[in-house]
Each structure stands twice: as C-alpha cells, then as structure tokens.
C-alpha cells in the first residue's frame, strides 16, 4: 500500500492552497491597513491576551480534542492548524468587507483578529464530523464556505435583529454543529470491511484528546467573554462559564461511570462532556445573575452530554456516518439549543420583571435568530457536502478513511502503520 498522495491530489492541493494564499495576500495588500490609533501599549498587551487564549483554544484545544483516532491523530492536529490559519485570514477580510468596506479600507484591530479566530473556531467544531473522510483540498473548500456562511449569518442577524457581537457570535455552537452534521450527511458513509478499526480510539491519541479537552476547559471562559462590551458583563461571563464547566466535569465523570454497567468511565464521554457547561451557558453567560444557576446549567448540560454520548452515536453512525468518538457535532447541537432556550427564558424573565409587555415580541425575535442560524447552517452545510463530493477533489477512497499514512510521510514505516 503506497503512502503517497494520489498524483492528482499532489498537483491539486499545493496549487489550490498556494493560489488561494496568494489571492489572500493580494486582498490584504489592496484592502487592509492597521489601526493607527493605538495610544496605550499596556492596554494593547492586555487586549491581546484574550486573542491569545482563543488561539490556544483553537490550535491546541480543538486540534488535540479531535486527535483520538488510532490512525488519524497526526492529520487531526495538523489539519486543524491548517484550517485555523486559513480561516482566520479569510474571516478578517470577510468581516471587514461586510462591516467596514463602504467607508474605505478594512481596518485591522486586535478585536477583528479576535472575531476572526472565533469564526475559524466554527470550522474546527464542524470538521469533527468529517475528519478522516476528507483531504486537505476538500477542507480548504469547507473553510471558505463555512467562514463565509457564518460571516453573512452574523451580518444578517446584526442588521435585522440589531444583535451585538456577543449574541450573534454565540450562535456559533448551533451553527457549527448543524453545518458539520449536514456536511457529514452528504459524504459517503459505510466503512468498508476491514477498516472499522481505524475509527477506534487508542490510548496515546486519547490522552492527547484529553489534553485538548483540558485546554478548552481552561480557556472556555475567555471564549464566552471575549466579545462583551463592558467589564461587568465580562466578569459575569467568566465566573458563570467557570462555574458551569466545573460542574460539568464532575457530572461528566460521575455520569459516565453511572452510564456504564460496570461503573467504568468512558474517555469519549469525558472528552466532550467536560465542555458541556461552557457551551450551554455561552449565550447567556453574562446575564445569569447568580452562580448556582450557572452550576445547575452545568449539571444539566453534563447529563445531556453523557446521555447523548451514550445513545446518539448509534443513530449518528448509521444516518450520518459519524464515528463513535466524533461526538462534538451532536453534542454541540443539543447543548447549543439548550443555551438558546436558557437565553430565551432569561429574556422572558427580564421582560416580565421590567413589566413592559413585550414578551411575545422578544421571544419571537430570539426564535427567529435561532431558526435563521440553523437554516443557514443546514443549507450551507449541504452545499459544502455536495461540493466536497465533486470528483475534482480526489477524496480519499473509503478504504483509506481515518488513515494518517495517506497524508503523512513516516520514514520508519515502509508499509502499514
């Protein structure tokens, strides 16, 4: 079995990726410039730290979280980095074109890099459902389509519903999940006989996936608070996210043990359930008025996550062809919906408390936003799935799914893995 790329992909990928990179460089040259008004260098460093947290989450957290496959760990980490690097560049340009361009050049600030990193994170969440079944050329397409779809969704929501940066970015959980699931649904599903072992997890990669989960766990408060307007809101977001993820860890480990007949703890459950609280509080993290509410939400999210991890993979594997260990997609779809519902409940409480009689209208707006996010995610996901099925991308043969050796040079291995 040759470990080389098929000849056509060897021609296609570098040409496609480098042409795209050259185009991006030209766009940056003609249409962007840096914010020249930075007065306070100390403040600049503090502001950069948030962006740094987001980059760590994306590159290390999500990179390693998806690396638990026995024979696909290298590709998971490196492809994630590739997608992040490409996604951030395109997201900065797209956000600039959509929000600033009429006034002239796109001004690049630390905030725009923050936004772009979060947009690229969406792709890294979605791709969990398809990693191992696609090559880098296909992933480039997925990055471009998803970042474009999310950017446009955010602009539409911002313009129609007048939502702030935090709110329209927090649809990322639901959007990324449904996008990834709809792409997966379009890809060839059955694994041929004899390759089932490749989508199993192994101890060393599972440990690195746990490392990814730990990085995400540590930095999730930064993610949920990154786009908030005032320090008091950011403080609330950090605290509430921290309480929620703390409780979801306890729930994940104990719930996993409870779900197993012999009381054993499943690595796969824990990888994803430790993050459950962070996803569930995302939308309303700055609004939750007291810690116990965030903790209850973390508990519920942890239970949903463990329950989902136990009962949904069978269905997802049959219908969508998603391997048992790639549970981020349906996990985030459930928890994202939970988060949106919590936000709507809090809005109702706010409206009732203020006695302003606008409950129906507020709920309608929120449901409209959520529905729009899901519809655009599904439509753009299906479009991406159809694009990825085109022959020009030379997708890996189904017998080579979840195989690092298709993509990587291993000098110490002549054949096999």
């Amino acid at each position: 079995m040759s470990s080389k790329y098929p000849r056509s992909v060897r021609r296609c990928l570098p040409l496609w990726a480098l042409t795209l990179e050259a185009a991006l460089i030209l766009l940056f040259y003609f249409f962007t410039h840096y914010d020249a008004s930075l007065e306070d260098q100390k403040g600049l460093v503090a502001s950069y730290q948030v962006g740094q947290d987001l980059t760590v989450m994306a590159a290390i957290g999500l990179g390693f979280l998806t690396s638990s496959f026995r024979r696909h760990s290298w590709s998971s980490v490196a492809f994630n980095l590739f997608m992040l690097a490409l996604g951030v560049q395109w997201a900065i340009l797209l956000d600039g074109f959509l929000s600033q361009f009429p006034s002239g050049k796109v001004v690049i600030t630390l905030f725009s890099i923050r936004l772009a990193t979060m947009s690229a994170l969406s792709v890294l969440i979605s791709v969990d459902a398809v990693l191992g079944k696609v090559n880098l050329a296909q992933l480039v397409v997925m990055v471009l389509v998803e970042v474009t779809a999310l950017g446009n969704l955010r602009m539409v929501i911002s313009n129609i519903f007048n939502t702030d940066y935090h709110m329209n970015m927090m649809h990322i959980y639901v959007f990324a999940a449904y996008f990834g699931l709809s792409v997966a649904w379009c890809l060839p599903k059955p694994l041929p006989e004899g390759t089932e072992d490749k989508d199993q997890t192994a101890t060393i990669p599972s440990l690195s996936a746990m490392l990814g989960a730990l990085f995400l766990w540590m930095f999730w408060p930064s993610f949920n608070s990154a786009l908030l307007r005032s320090p008091i809101e950011r403080k609330n977001a950090v605290f509430n996210t921290y309480y929620a993820v703390a409780v979801s860890v306890v729930t994940a480990i104990s719930g996993s043990s409870l779900a197993h007949p012999q009381g054993k703890i499943s690595k796969t459950y824990v990888h994803s359930a430790v993050l459950a609280g962070g996803v569930a509080v995302g939308t309303s993290c700055h609004l939750i008025p007291s810690p116990w509410l965030a903790m209850v939400l973390g508990l519920v999210a942890g239970l949903i996550s463990v329950g989902g991890a136990k009962y949904l993979p069978g269905c997802c594997n049959r219908v969508l062809g998603i391997p048992h260990s790639s549970i981020m997609g349906y996990n985030f779809s459930l928890l994202g919906l939970l988060g949106e519902i919590i936000y709507i409940v809090l809005l109702v409480l706010d409206t009732v408390g203020a006695g302003n009689g606008m409950i129906g209208f507020q709920v309608l707006l929120s449901i409209g936003e959520l529905s729009l996010a899901i519809v655009i995610a599904l439509m753009s996901g299906l479009l991406t799935g159809l694009l990825l099925n085109l022959k020009i991308w030379k997708a890996p043969h189904e017998a080579k799914y979840f195989d690092d050796q298709v993509f990587w040079k291993f000098p110490h291995l002549a054949v096999g893995f």
Epitope: L38, A46, S47, T109, N162, R229, L287, N356
Partner: antibody
C-alpha cells in the same frame, strides 16, 4: 470627585485637522467605555463615537466615519478624538461622556452618566 | 440607523404642571432608552436609563415609561429648575442616536 475635562478645541480651517483630549479623574478610567457627543450651535445633541473600555472596539456615526478617530490611553486616563478633513458642519461643542452599564432585571443597559463641560470647535475659513 | 422622534419640539408650562414628553423609535428598541436634561451652556445630565429607572440623585418627580417603540418622560409637578431641553437617546444598537430635543419653557 468624578470629572471629565475636554481640551484641544479652537478655530480651524476646512480640510485641516484637530485633536481633542478628555482627561478623566475620580474613577477607574480603564473600566468604562467612553463617548464623544457634539452639539452644533442652536441644535440638538449628536452622538459621534464610542470606544470600549479596553480600546478593543470603536464605532462612529456615519457623518464622521473615515474622518474621525477615537482612541484612549488608559495609562494616562485620557480619551482622544482625532478629527481630520474638517468641514464647516463639524462646528460644534464637543463633549466626552462616560458609559455606564447598569443591570436591569436580567439584562444590562447602557447610558452616559458623566459628562465633561465641553470644548468648542469652529471650522471656518 | 434608528431614528428617534420627540414630540412636542417645544412646550410652555407653568410651575406645578404635569408635563409629558414622548419619544418614538423607528423600530423596536426594547427598553434601551435614556432621557437627558440640558440647560443652556451646560452639559447634558442623565435623568432616566433603561426607559424607566431613575438615575441616583434625580428627583422622584421625573419618571419614564414605555418599551419597544413608544416612550414617555413625565414630570409630575414642574419646578423652576426643570425648565430646560430634554433629549431621549437609544442604546439598543452600536450606533447610538438622540431625539431632536424638547424645549420646556415657562408659560
């Protein structure tokens, strides 16, 4: 005492530039968003620009976008407004104001609770 | 941008009168509405935030109501120091906007 003091106003020719400053005292400057608001002679208030507490985000009214730049130096407790390509219609009293976030029942609401005394900018040939 | 329209643009009233000023938004702004008072040659002063919450230090004769599109500022019993111009302002969107102002004069 919480105080905002604007400076830098004056008479300037159309097309020229001017930089306004707003010195803050009596509160923790780096935890508040800051705004510039102007008032043309005999006219109402017009919101001009805002900068977030950490300087990470800025917004401008359409009438000044691309010409005015808001910035802040948290180490000096100072807010700035760099005004380029000035026009006659930019003649006004310019106020800086502090943004406060106040919790409602659940949500946060924003208002400008502290204002400076204003500095006059006259654009005339 | 959201347009804010105040009415009336000016009114004459006597000390002790009940005065009502209305503000209408071009689209729903929930309760993201503030009221300011400005006296000639002075900086504006925050009276009401979040449509109906009284800013500390502001007399209780001032009150605000409304949500969505229509809002009202009421002065229950006009005092000599209340003769000024009043502005509504929305903070619902990132680009804030003021109403054109209502001048309250002595009859």
């Amino acid at each position: 005492e919480v105080q905002l003091v604007e400076s830098g106003g004056g008479v300037v020719q159309p097309g020229r530039s001017l930089r306004l400053s707003c010195a803050a005292s009596g509160f923790t400057f780096n935890t508040y968003g800051m705004h510039w608001v102007r008032q043309a002679p005999g006219k109402g208030l017009e919101w001009v620009a805002v900068i977030w507490y950490d300087g990470s985000n800025k917004y401008y009214a359409d009438s000044v976008k691309g010409r005015f730049t808001i910035s802040r130096d948290n180490s000096k407790n100072t807010l700035y407004l760099q005004m380029n390509s000035l026009r006659a219609e930019d003649t006004a009293v310019y106020y800086c104001a502090r943004e406060v976030a106040v919790r409602g029942v659940i949500r946060y609401y924003y208002a400008m609770d502290v204002w400076g005394q204003g500095t006059t900018v006259t654009v005339s040939s | 941008d959201i347009q804010m329209t105040q009415s009336p643009s000016s009114l004459s009233a006597s000390v002790g009168d009940r005065v009502t000023i209305t503000c209408r938004a071009s689209q729903s702004i929930s309760s993201y509405l503030n009221w300011y008072q400005q006296k000639p040659g002075k900086a504006p002063k925050l009276l009401i935030y979040a449509a109906s919450s009284l800013q500390s230090g502001v007399p209780s004769r001032f009150s605000g109501s409304g949500s969505g599109i229509d809002f009202t500022l009421t002065i229950s019993s006009l005092q000599p120091e209340d003769f000024a111009t009043y502005y509504c302002q929305q903070s619902y969107t990132t680009l804030w906007t003021f109403g054109q102002g209502t001048k309250v004069e002595i009859k």
